[in-house]
Interface confidence: low
C-alpha cells in the first residue's frame, strides 16, 4: 500500500512543482532574449530561415516517419541527410526490408504508405548492399513488373529497364504468366532475380530517396 500524502505535503509538493515550472519559464525567456539580442547584433537571417525550413521539412515527413536518423553530409554543418529509423542507407537512398508476406500490389501499396516504392536496383553495388540485409531462405519483391505479359519489364519509378543492368537467375525470366520479379538465393548461383506470379505473397524491399534537411 502507498501511504496517502498529508494535505500540507501535497501543497508543498505542488508549490515546488509550480516553482520549477516558473523557473524553467524564466530561464527559457532569458535564453530567448539572449538569442534575439545576438541575432540583432549579428545577421543570422540565413541560419534562422534554414532552421525554419528544416522544421517545416521535418514536420512534412513526420506523417510518414515519426523518427529519423540523420548524418552530416560532408564537412558542411548545414547539410544533413536522413533516413527513417530503422531503415538502412546506401548512397542517396534509404531501404526497408518488409517481412510481412503480401502480394506484389499490396507490397507496393505498403511501401507507398511509407513514402517509398518497391526497390529499383540500378547497379551491382546497390544489389550487393541490399543482399547483406536479406535472408537466404526468403524471397523479396522488387519494383519490377511486366503487366502485359509481353516481356516489357518496367520499374515502378519509370526508370528505363536496361537489359545490361539486370541480375536474373540463369533461365529467368521464363514464364509469361509470371509478371512480377523477386530477388532470392539459389545455392548454385547465389542471389538473383526470378519472375513469379504477382499474387503469391512474398516479403519485399522498399526504397526511398534520402531526406535532406
Amino acid at each position: 500500500m502507498v501511504p496517502e500524502e498529508e494535505p500540507q505535503d501535497r501543497e508543498k509538493g505542488l508549490w515546488w512543482f509550480q516553482l520549477k515550472v516558473w523557473s524553467m519559464a524564466v530561464v527559457s525567456i532569458l535564453l530567448l532574449s539572449v538569442c534575439f539580442t545576438v541575432s540583432s547584433v549579428v545577421p543570422h537571417n540565413f541560419m534562422y530561415s534554414k532552421t525554419v525550413k528544416r522544421l517545416s521539412k521535418l514536420r512534412e515527413y513526420q506523417q510518414y516517419h515519426p523518427s529519423l536518423t540523420c548524418v552530416m553530409e560532408g564537412k558542411d554543418i548545414e547539410d544533413w541527410s536522413c533516413c527513417p529509423t530503422p531503415w538502412t542507407s546506401f548512397q542517396s537512398s534509404c531501404y526497408f526490408i518488409s517481412t510481412g508476406m503480401q502480394s506484389w500490389t499490396k507490397s507496393q501499396k505498403n511501401c507507398s504508405v511509407m513514402g517509398a516504392d518497391l526497390v529499383v536496383i540500378n547497379t551491382r553495388e546497390e544489389q550487393d548492399f541490399i543482399i547483406q540485409n536479406l535472408k537466404r531462405n526468403s524471397s523479396y519483391f522488387l519494383g519490377l513488373s511486366d503487366p502485359g505479359g509481353r516481356r516489357h519489364w518496367q520499374w515502378v519509378d519509370q526508370t528505363p529497364y536496361n537489359e545490361n543492368v539486370t541480375f536474373w537467375h540463369s533461365g529467368e525470366p521464363n514464364n509469361l504468366d509470371e509478371r512480377c520479379a523477386i530477388i532470392n538465393f539459389r545455392s548454385s548461383e547465389e542471389w538473383g532475380w526470378n519472375d513469379i506470379h504477382c499474387h503469391v505473397p512474398q516479403k519485399s524491399i522498399c526504397k526511398m530517396k534520402k531526406i535532406y534537411i
Partner: nanobody
Amino acid sequence: QVQLQESGGGLVQAGDSLRLSCAPSGFTFDGYAIGWFRQAPGKEREKVACINKSDGLTYYEDSVKGRFTISSDTAKNTIHLQMNSLKPDDTAVYYCAAAWECDYAPADFGSWGQGTQVTVSS
C-alpha cells in the same frame, strides 16, 4: 487472389491411410516448392513434407519418413500427400502452401489454404 485448396481429410483409425490433395486457383505449380504443413491444437505449425517442382526433389520431416509420400500430378496441376500407417499423433489440421525452395521457413511460404482436418483415433 491466388490460393491453394486442400481436400481429403477425415476421421480414420490408427494404422489406416488417407490421401490429401492440394490444388491451386489462379496459378500453376511450375517452378514452385509446395509444402504440406500441419498444426495440432496448442502446437506450432510444422512442415511435414515438401516437393521442389523445379527438380522434383522431396523432403520429409523425420516423424513421417517412410509413412508419408508427397507427389505431383502435373496433368491435374495437383499435389498429393499419401499418408499411410497413421498414428493418433498425426491428428492435426493439414495445410499446403507455396514457396521457392523447400528449405524456406513456414513463415516464408504463401498462399495458404483453409486446411483440412485429419483425425486419427486409437
